[in-house]
């Protein structure tokens, strides 16, 4: 049986954990309320460092952060699998690490977007992330709440594999989305979103260049390069994906 957190004070529902936490949510469950860097060790995985964001909704693991263009996100499959960047700055946690956190559980995926005028948007999805054998396919497992969902992600039940310029798994036969855009992403038809695109500090004039940027079509439009993005994941309790 997996080692569980041991209750030490049932009256106050405080628990102790005598191993590294499996994820940020488990840290939250044993009373950690300070966001920041923690070493975690999901089952069957070596330990690794993550950014935990503690909120009223529990503990979330930050899996992506962009805000200044300091890190090149136009990288091959192995980089997206392993992760890259600076945990204190811009980074991609790594598909294998994210999958080790979620396992076969459904998860909540939160996406925070910010434009250059200080406007922000928060989107939440219920998702399931497959393993490398599925090219880390992202499947929507429940309808998306809010205005932006419908045209942003695949219909509920459809899986979209992850793609990079050297591993083309997108849903277009005639095009390599990662190559014609930039970075690795769950590309469907190339045009809905790409939060791992090229970072632009100023908006380029040529549309051909613009399309390579960081965008979320249903929020600020296909050709608006966003200023900052953060992606966070939180596995849901116990229930496995069907």
């Amino acid at each position: 049986l997996p080692e569980m957190a041991q209750p030490v004070d049932p009256a106050h529902n405080v628990s102790r954990l005598h191993r590294l936490p499996r994820d940020c949510q488990e840290l939250f469950q044993v009373g950690e309320r300070q966001s920041g860097l923690f070493e975690i060790q999901p089952q069957g995985s070596p330990p690794f460092l993550v950014n935990c964001k503690m909120t009223s909704d529990g503990g979330w693991t930050v899996i992506q952060r962009r805000h200044d263009g300091s890190v090149d996100f136009n990288r091959p499959w192995e980089a997206y699998k392993a992760g890259f960047g600076d945990p204190h700055g811009e980074f991609w946690l790594g598909l294998e690490k994210v999958h080790s956190i979620t396992g076969d559980r459904n998860s909540r995926l939160a996406v925070q977007l910010r434009d250059w005028d200080g406007n922000a948007e928060l989107l939440q999805f219920s998702v399931h992330l497959g393993g490398e054998d599925t090219a880390y396919s992202l499947q929507l497992t429940a309808p998306v709440a809010g205005q932006l969902g419908a045209t942003t992600v695949p219909p509920s039940g459809l899986s979209v594999p992850f793609s990079t310029w050297d591993q083309d798994h997108d849903l277009r036969r005639d095009k390599n989305c990662a190559k014609s855009l930039s970075g690795g992403w769950w590309f469907g038809t190339c045009s809905h979103s790409n939060l791992n695109g090229q970072y632009f500090r100023s908006i380029p004039q040529q549309r051909q260049k613009l399309k390579k940027g960081i965008f979320w079509k249903t929020w600020r439009g296909r050709y608006y390069p966003l200023q900052a993005t953060t992606m966070l994941i939180q596995p849901m309790a116990a229930e496995a994906a069907s």
Partner: nanobody
Framework: EVQLVESGGGLVQPGGSLRLSCAAS???????????MGWFRQAPGKEREFVAA????????PYADSVKGRFAISRDNAKNTLTLQMNSLKPEDTAVYYC????????????????WGQGTQVTVSS
């Protein structure tokens, strides 16, 4: 200047117990509870290895498999002290034991520790 000073080491027979303490001082440690703390050990001719760690709140206390159930780590944030209670000691526990502090919330990996003590010798022998 941050200072970590270990004490409590010594010679003990197999099956015996020892209690190691680590006192933290210095301007940076006016907020001791903003650091996670850990114990590491280094036996002659071997690499330094993780023993146990404790989060800022004290609720997360990972242990190396080799000491689980025998050692207990604790902290007193009011007194800026870290403690390692070592029971059922074995000859293979012989090593220099180091106290360390990290800005990471919890960690078992050496490179995530910023401050180190000088170490205290523990010898388990009959």
């Amino acid at each position: 200047e941050v200072q970590l000073v270990e004490s409590g080491g010594g010679l003990v027979q197999p099956g015996g117990s020892l209690r190691l303490s680590c006192a933290a001082s210095g301007r940076t440690f006016s907020t001791f509870n903003t650091y996670s703390m850990g114990w590491f050990r280094q036996a002659p001719g071997k690499e330094r290895e993780f023993v146990a760690a404790i989060s800022r709140s004290g609720n997360v206390t990972p242990y190396a498999d080799s000491v689980k159930g025998r050692f207990a780590i604790s902290r007193d944030n009011a007194k800026n002290t870290l403690t390692l209670q070592m029971n059922s000691l074995k000859p293979e526990d012989t090593a220099v034991y180091y106290c360390a502090a990290s800005k990471i919330g919890i960690a078992s990996t050496i490179r995530y520790y910023d401050y180190w003590g000088q170490g205290t010798q523990v010898t388990v022998s009959s």
